[in-house]
């Protein structure tokens, strides 16, 4: 019998390489059974995750999964950092793993850093 717990399928230790000025959609894959939970995004500040208020979010439905999307319109250099989604389910809070956005400021970047180079910036790795 499949579990009817809410699950948030952000990959552990995942990363995204994006450019300032571009639009970007950060997806939180959500598995639930009957009632779609309330989901929120937060941004990590040290060990505290600060809830993102007043941001453009939306839902996308696919076959076996829903996606709670945080829209960046456009991406700003200050969007650099780690994000987590959380779901309210039966009075419990389920937290996803964090995912890190590496934002390249096109004004200061002569060439795009390699994805591995960016992933090895230790000051950005919260998890």
């Amino acid at each position: 019998k499949e579990s009817c717990d809410v699950q948030l399928y952000i990959k552990r230790q995942s990363y995204h390489s994006i450019f300032a000025g571009d639009p970007f959609k950060l997806e939180c894959p959500v598995k639930y059974c009957a009632h779609r939970p309330q989901v929120t995004w937060c941004k990590l500040n040290g060990t505290t995750c600060v809830k993102l208020e007043g941001r453009h979010t939306s839902w996308k439905q696919e076959k076996n999964l829903s996606f709670f999307i945080l829209h960046f319109e456009p991406v700003l250099p200050s969007d650099n950092g780690s994000y987590r989604c959380s779901a309210n389910f039966l009075s419990a809070i389920i937290e996803s793993h964090s995912t890190t956005l590496y934002v390249t400021d096109v004004k200061s970047a002569s060439e795009r850093p390699s994805k591995d180079e960016m992933a090895s910036r230790p000051w950005l790795l919260y998890s």
Epitope: R12, Y15, H16, S17, H97, K115, D116, S127
Partner: antibody, heavy 120, light 112 residues
Framework: QVQLQESGPGLVKPSGTLSLTCADS????????IHWVRQPPGKGLEWIGR????????RYNPSLKSRVTISSDKSKNQASLKLSSVTAADTAVYYC?????????????WGQGTTVTVSS | DIVMTQSPDSLALSLGERATINCKSS???????????LNWFQQKPGQPPKRLIY???KLDSGVPDRFSGSGSGTDFTLTISSVQAEDVAVYYC?????????FGQGTKLEIK
């Protein structure tokens, strides 16, 4: 059932480039991470690196980073390993392995491995 | 890099004896999510490694319950309560918390 299969030349010349492919016939690779691990004859296991096929992000073992490239092709459900400037010390069995997802995140499925000999 | 040190390097036991393999990491393997990504693998000659235990103590499906894992932080143990002939293999610990991922050097289990 997840089935991983490594393939590539079994013999590579010194200073050449080792190229291997990992085909995943039992899982959509974009939903997971694919790792490469090697094992020299009679020795232990060494982690080479991993790729997130969803976005191409790689993490490499610093001891090999200057010579290694891991890539993926979502349309073919494949990951690839390239190791340049090889020497006899790179002779090993090379494995690809799948990292299972939520909530365990460990290497749960392995290919059978392919033996690569570096020799002229 | 996190160094994973296993002890002993090898052990020879009689059938039915208890096997204890230790694994010590150079840093804590407790991740920010509160989980400890320490795994044990078994490798028999000519075969790929097979996962036995994940998250320190969770037994993989199909693994006999004579195998168990314990520990926390930097010190971990794999125990085989009653060694059987089919347990002859090399056992590796592996940490999935930090980059680069690292294995222990392996412990060879033989039957006396």
């Amino acid at each position: 059932q997840v089935q991983l299969q490594e393939s590539g030349p079994g013999l590579v010349k010194p200073s050449g480039t080792l190229s291997l492919t990992c085909a995943d016939s039992g899982f959509n690779i974009k939903d997971t991470y694919i790792h490469w691990v090697r094992q020299p004859p009679g020795k232990g296991l060494e982690w080479i690196g991993r790729i997130d096929p969803a976005n191409g992000f790689t993490r490499y073992n610093p001891s090999l980073k200057s010579r290694v490239t891991i890539s993926s092709d979502k349309s073919k459900n494949q990951a690839s390993l390239k190791l340049s400037s090889v020497t006899a010390a790179d002779t090993a069995v090379y494995y690809c392995a799948r990292e299972d997802g939520y909530p365990y995140y460990t290497l749960d499925s392995w290919g059978q491995g392919t033996t690569v000999t570096v020799s002229s | 890099d996190i160094v994973m040190t296993q002890s002993p390097d090898s052990l020879a036991l009689s059938l039915g004896e208890r096997a204890t393999i230790n694994c010590k990491s150079s840093q804590s393997l407790l991740d920010v999510d509160g989980k400890t990504y320490l795994n044990w693998f078994q490798q028999k000659p000519g075969q790929p490694p097979k996962r036995l235990i994940y998250l320190v103590s969770k037994l993989d499906s199909g693994v006999p319950d004579r195998f168990s894992g314990s520990g926390s932080g930097t010190d971990f143990t794999l125990t085989i309560s009653s060694v059987q002939a089919e347990d002859v293999a090399v056992y590796y610990c592996w940490q999935g918390t930090h980059f680069p991922r690292t294995f222990g050097q392996g412990t060879k289990l033989e039957i006396k």
